[in-house]
C-alpha cells in the first residue's frame, strides 16, 4: 500500500548489525509523486566499491547509489548525511553484510517522503504535445485554439477527420492550406462513390509540400491513399512524388494525412473524380466481341460470339454467343463462360455399317462410315466421310447431316456357280452360289430375296398359304440344317392383282401373272450365304433374247428324288415360247389347248434334260446383268411347265418391275434410326 513517508533502519539498529545479512525494502509512494530518500546515520564497514557491506538504492533497473563507511552531515543545521531524489514513485533499498566485521558497525537510519514532481519539466520526453500544466501529484495537457485534446489526454490535433465525399467530382486539401498544416494531427477523408465508378485522384506537383523524409527514407509527415487492399503512398516532400493521376480501381478511397510535432509546411491540394469502372479488354479465345471498343467501362454490355465450330457450354445447353456486362467491381459478368470447340459427340451408329471410334469428337474432327462389305454398300453416296461442323452435327459434303444408308449389294454370289452336268439334269450347288435362294417348306418351293424386307416368289406358291415359313442361308434343308439357318417370318403376302384365284388350284391352266411379294416382319441380315438378287432394269438391255443363259436353283424334284435335300442348280438357255407350247403336258388336268401362254412368260430349257421341276417354283431364273457382269438379276421366276426335263415357263419379272416397286414403296415402314 503506497505511503507518503517512512523510516528504514538497518537490522538491530542502533546496535551493531549482524554478519551475513541481506535485507531489502520496497518503497512505494502514490502515483504522481517522486521519492526523497535521506540518511541521517551511516556507519557501514568501508570497502572498495562497498564490496563487503553496503546499502544499495535501486530505482527500476537503475542503481541510484551504493553506500558504505561513515558519514556525517556537512550542514550543522541538518542531520542528513546522504540523500536521493527520484521522480518515480517506487524505490528499492537493499542492505547486505558479509561474513565478518573487523569492528562493531551500527548500520544506518534513513527516511523517505513523497515529493511532488513537475512532469512538465522533470523528464526528457515532454508529456504534452502543446501545453503542460503541473499540479501536486500530477499534470494535465491543454491545447491552443481550434485544437482539441485527443483521447490519450496528451496530444492535441485539429478536427480534420470524418468528412465523406460522395459527389462524382470534388477537391480536398490539407487543413489551413496553403497555410502550414497543423502538427501532430491525423486527418482522414473518405471518398465514397456509387458502385461501378472508380475514384481517380489528380494532383499537381506544385500543390504538394509536406515535411520531407528522414535520412532512412521514412516520411515524418505523410499522405496515404487506401483503396480496398491497395495502398498508394506514403507520399512526402516538396512537390508530389507519386503519379499525378491515380486510378484506384475502387469506388471507395480513404485519404490519411499524418503529421508529427515539427516541420509544418503548406500541405497539399488534390482533385478527384469518378470514372466508370473500366473492365479489361480480355482475350477470349475463339470469339469476337460486339461492339469492339478500345476501352470498356461500367455498364457496358458486349455480345461475345463464338467463332464457327465453337460454342458456349453452360450446363447441358450449348449456345453460340453470350452477353457479358462490365460490372461495378471492374470484372465482366459471365467471365467463366468460354468458347469451347463444338463437340459433335459420339457419332450415331448405322444399320449394317460401322464408324470407327473417333480420336476426337470436337470441331473439325473427321470420321468415316463404312458399310459391311462386301454385302452392303453406301446407297446415298457421300463417301462416308463426315466432319464435325460448327453447328455440332457430323456433316457430309453431299448428304449434309443425313446419315449414310448401307443397303445390301444385290446379285453377287460369294462363290460363283460352276455348272456340273448331273433340279433335272442339274447338279449340286452351294447356297453361297445362290445366296438369294429362299426355301419355302409348305408348299415345298422357292423364292428370291430382293432386299432386306422383301421376298419375290410365284403367286401359286403362296395362294394357298398366306403365312409361309421361309428359310435362307442353308444349302441343305434337313430339319437340323434349317434350325441352324435363318427363318424368315412374313408380315404380309401381296399376290399380283392379275393372278386369277381358283377354287381348285390343281386344275389351273392359266399361270399368267404368276408373281407375288412377301413382306417380312424383320430385316434380313446379309452375309456370304444370304444376299439379294437384283431386279431387272426397265431399259431394253434387259429384254431377253433366245439363247441367253440363266441359272435356276432349288430343292425341287430331281431324277432320283421327289425333293432334293441339298440345293441343286442348272444353267439353261432362253427358248422361243413356241418350244414350250410344243411340249406335250405330262399329266394334263385339262385339254392341251386350254393352257395359256402369254408375253409375261419366258420359255427356257430343252438342253441336256436340264429343267426346273415340282418344288422349284418361285425360285429365280438368274441372268447376268448386261451392264455389270459381276451381278445377276431375276429375269424370271419358276412358274410352271408341261413336262419336267424339257422346257419350263418362268414369269417375266421385267414386266412387273413397276408393280414390285410400287408395292414395296407403299408398304415400307420407315427405318427406325
Amino acid at each position: 500500500e503506497p505511503t507518503m513517508y517512512g523510516e528504514i533502519l538497518s537490522p538491530n539498529y542502533p546496535q551493531a548489525y549482524p554478519s551475513e545479512v541481506e535485507k531489502s525494502w520496497d518503497i512505494e509512494v502514490p502515483e504522481g509523486y517522486g521519492i526523497h530518500l535521506y540518511f541521517t546515520h551511516l556507519d557501514i564497514e568501508l570497502s572498495e566499491n562497498c564490496a563487503y557491506d553496503s546499502v544499495q538504492i535501486i530505482s527500476g533497473d537503475t542503481e541510484e547509489g551504493r553506500l558504505c563507511g561513515q558519514r556525517s552531515s556537512n550542514n550543522p543545521h541538518s542531520p542528513i548525511v546522504e540523500e536521493f531524489q527520484v521522480p518515480y514513485n517506487k524505490l528499492q533499498v537493499i542492505f547486505k553484510s558479509d561474513f565478518s566485521n573487523e569492528e562493531r558497525f551500527t548500520g544506518f537510519a534513513a527516511y523517505y517522503v513523497a515529493t511532488d514532481i513537475n512532469e512538465c519539466t522533470d523528464f526528457v520526453d515532454v508529456p504534452c504535445s502543446h501545453f503542460c500544466n503541473n499540479f501536486i501529484g500530477g499534470y494535465f495537457c491543454s491545447c491552443p485554439p481550434e485544437y482539441f485534446l485527443h483521447d490519450d489526454m496528451k496530444n492535441c490535433g485539429v478536427n480534420c477527420s470524418g468528412d465523406v465525399f460522395t459527389a462524382l467530382i470534388g477537391e480536398i486539401a490539407s487543413p489551413n492550406y496553403p497555410k502550414p498544416y497543423p502538427e501532430n494531427s491525423r486527418c482522414e477523408y473518405q471518398i465514397r462513390l456509387e458502385k461501378g465508378f472508380q475514384v481517380v485522384v489528380t494532383l499537381r506537383r506544385e500543390d504538394f509540400d509536406v515535411e520531407a523524409a528522414d535520412s532512412a527514407g521514412n516520411c515524418l509527415d505523410s499522405l496515404v491513399f487506401v483503396a480496398g487492399d491497395r495502398q498508394f503512398g506514403p507520399y512526402c516532400g516538396h512537390g508530389f512524388p507519386g503519379p499525378l493521376n491515380i486510378e484506384t480501381k475502387s469506388n471507395a478511397l480513404d485519404i490519411i494525412f499524418q503529421t508529427d510535432l515539427t516541420g509544418q509546411k503548406k500541405g497539399w491540394k488534390l482533385r478527384y473524380h469518378g470514372d466508370p469502372m473500366p473492365c479489361p479488354k480480355e482475350d477470349t479465345p475463339n470469339s469476337v466481341w460486339e461492339p469492339a471498343k478500345a476501352k470498356y467501362v461500367f455498364r457496358d454490355v458486349v455480345q461475345i460470339t463464338c467463332l464457327d465450330g465453337f460454342e458456349v457450354v453452360e450446363g447441358r445447353v450449348g449456345a453460340t454467343s453470350f452477353y457479358s456486362t462490365c460490372q461495378s467491381n471492374g470484372k465482366w459478368s459471365n467471365s467463366k463462360l468460354k468458347c469451347q470447340p463444338v463437340d459433335c459427340g459420339i457419332p450415331e451408329s448405322i444399320e449394317n455399317g460401322k464408324v470407327e471410334d473417333p480420336e476426337s469428337t470436337l470441331f473439325g474432327s473427321v470420321i468415316r462410315y463404312t458399310c459391311e462389305e462386301p454385302y452392303y454398300y453406301m446407297e446415298n453416296g457421300g463417301g462416308g466421310e463426315y466432319h464435325c461442323a460448327g453447328n455440332g452435327s457430323w456433316v457430309n459434303e453431299v448428304l449434309g447431316p443425313e446419315l449414310p444408308k448401307c443397303v445390301p449389294v444385290c446379285g453377287v454370289p460369294r462363290e460363283p456357280f460352276e455348272e456340273k452336268q448331273r433340279i433335272i439334269g442339274g447338279s449340286d450347288a452351294d447356297i453361297k452360289n445362290f445366296p438369294w435362294q429362299v426355301f419355302f417348306d409348305n408348299p415345298w418351293a422357292g423364292g428370291a430375296l430382293i432386299n432386306e424386307y422383301w421376298v419375290l416368289t410365284a403367286a401359286h406358291v403362296v395362294e394357298g398359304n398366306r403365312e409361309p415359313t421361309m428359310y435362307v442361308g442353308s444349302t441343305s434343308v434337313q430339319t437340323s440344317r434349317l434350325a441352324k439357318s435363318k427363318m424368315l417370318t412374313p408380315e404380309h403376302v401381296f399376290i399380283h392383282p392379275g393372278w386369277k384365284l381358283l377354287e381348285v388350284p390343281e386344275g389351273r391352266t392359266n399361270f399368267d401373272n404368276d408373281i407375288a411379294l412377301v413382306r417380312l416382319k424383320d430385316p434380313v441380315k446379309m452375309g456370304p450365304t444370304v444376299s439379294p438378287i437384283c431386279l431387272p432394269g426397265t431399259s431394253s438391255d434387259y429384254n431377253l433374247m433366245d439363247g441367253d443363259l440363266g441359272l435356276i436353283s432349288g430343292w425341287g424334284r430331281t431324277e432320283k428324288r421327289d425333293r432334293a435335300v441339298r440345293l441343286k442348280a442348272a444353267r439353261l438357255p432362253v427358248a422361243p415360247l413356241r418350244k414350250c407350247k410344243e411340249v406335250k403336258v405330262e399329266k394334263p388336268t385339262a385339254d392341251a389347248e386350254a393352257y395359256v401362254f402369254t408375253p409375261n412368260m419366258i420359255c427356257a430349257g430343252g438342253e441336256k434334260g436340264m429343267d426346273s421341276c415340282k418344288g422349284d417354283s418361285g425360285g429365280a431364273f438368274a441372268v447376268q446383268d448386261p451392264n455389270d457382269k459381276t451381278k445377276f438379276y431375276a429375269a424370271g421366276l419358276v412358274s410352271w411347265g408341261p413336262q419336267c426335263g424339257t422346257y419350263g415357263l418362268y414369269t417375266r419379272v421385267k414386266n412387273y418391275v413397276d408393280w414390285i416397286m410400287k408395292t414395296m414403296q407403299e408398304n415400307s415402314t420407315p427405318r427406325e434410326d
Partner: antibody, heavy 118, light 107 residues
C-alpha cells in the same frame, strides 16, 4: 469308271501325325462333296469328316475335331486328311467316299490302314 | 448327336428267307436315312437312299421303309451273295452317324 484310291496310311506313334490322300478319277471331282469314313478293326463304320465342292464348308466328328483337317485340291483331283495328335483309338481303315448327292455315298475307295501304337 | 440303334446285331437265315433289319433314330430324322452293304474285306456299297429309294443297279429284293424314328430294311428272298454286314446311316444332321451294323449269315 469311278475310282477312289487312298494312300498315306501306316504305323505311327501316339501323338504323331499322318497325311492321308485320296486320288479320284473317272468323274469330275469338283462336282462332288467328299467325305472320310473310318472303320476300326472288327468294328462298325464311323463318319469322320466332310468337305463341300469348293472346300469352303467342312464338318468333323467330335472325336477328331481340332486334330484332323480335311482339304481338297480340285485341280489335282485329290482329297486329303491331315491327322495330328494321333491316339490309339484312331487306329482304323480310312475310306474316302464320294457323296453322290444328298448325303448318299455311292462310291468308296478300298481304304488305307492307319495304326497308332507305341 | 443323333444315335442310331440297329437290331439285331447279327442274324442267321436260310436262302430264300425274308430278312428284316430295323434301325431306330434317337430323334425324328424324317426320311433322311441310307442303307449300305459291306462284304468282308470290301468297302461299303449304297443300297437304299432316302429311306426307301433303291439305288440304280441294286436288285429289287432289297427294300427300305419308314420315316421319323423307325426304319426297316428288308431282303425279300435271301441269296448266298447277300452274306454281309448291313449299316443304316442318318443324314438329318452332323455328325453323320452309322448304325452299329447287322451281320447276316446263311444257316
Amino acid at each position: 469308271q469311278v475310282q477312289l484310291v487312298e494312300s498315306g496310311g501306316g504305323l505311327v506313334k501316339p501323338g504323331g501325325s499322318l497325311r492321308l490322300s485320296c486320288a479320284a478319277s473317272g468323274f469330275t471331282f469338283s462336282d462332288y462333296y467328299m467325305s472320310w469314313i473310318r472303320q476300326a478293326p472288327g468294328k462298325g463304320l464311323e463318319w469322320v469328316s466332310y468337305i463341300s465342292r469348293s472346300g469352303s464348308t467342312k464338318y468333323y466328328a467330335d472325336s477328331v475335331k481340332g486334330r484332323f483337317t480335311i482339304s481338297r485340291d480340285n485341280a489335282k483331283n485329290s482329297l486329303y486328311l491331315q491327322m495330328n495328335s494321333l491316339r490309339a483309338e484312331d487306329t482304323a481303315v480310312y475310306y474316302c467316299a464320294r457323296d453322290e448327292t444328298d448325303y448318299a455315298y455311292d462310291n468308296w475307295g478300298q481304304g488305307t490302314l492307319v495304326t497308332v501304337s507305341s | 448327336d443323333i444315335q442310331m440303334t440297329q437290331s439285331p446285331s447279327s442274324l442267321s437265315a436260310s436262302v430264300g428267307d425274308r430278312v428284316t433289319i430295323t434301325c431306330q433314330a434317337s430323334q425324328d430324322i424324317s426320311n433322311y436315312l441310307n442303307w449300305y452293304q459291306q462284304k468282308p474285306g470290301k468297302a461299303p456299297k449304297l443300297l437304299i437312299y432316302d429311306a426307301s429309294n433303291l439305288e440304280t443297279g441294286v436288285p429289287s429284293r432289297f427294300s427300305g421303309s419308314g420315316s421319323g424314328t423307325d426304319f426297316t430294311f428288308t431282303i425279300s428272298s435271301l441269296q448266298p451273295e447277300d452274306i454281309a454286314t448291313y449299316y443304316c446311316q442318318q443324314y438329318e444332321d452332323y455328325p453323320l452317324v452309322f448304325g452299329g451294323g447287322t451281320k447276316v449269315e446263311i444257316k
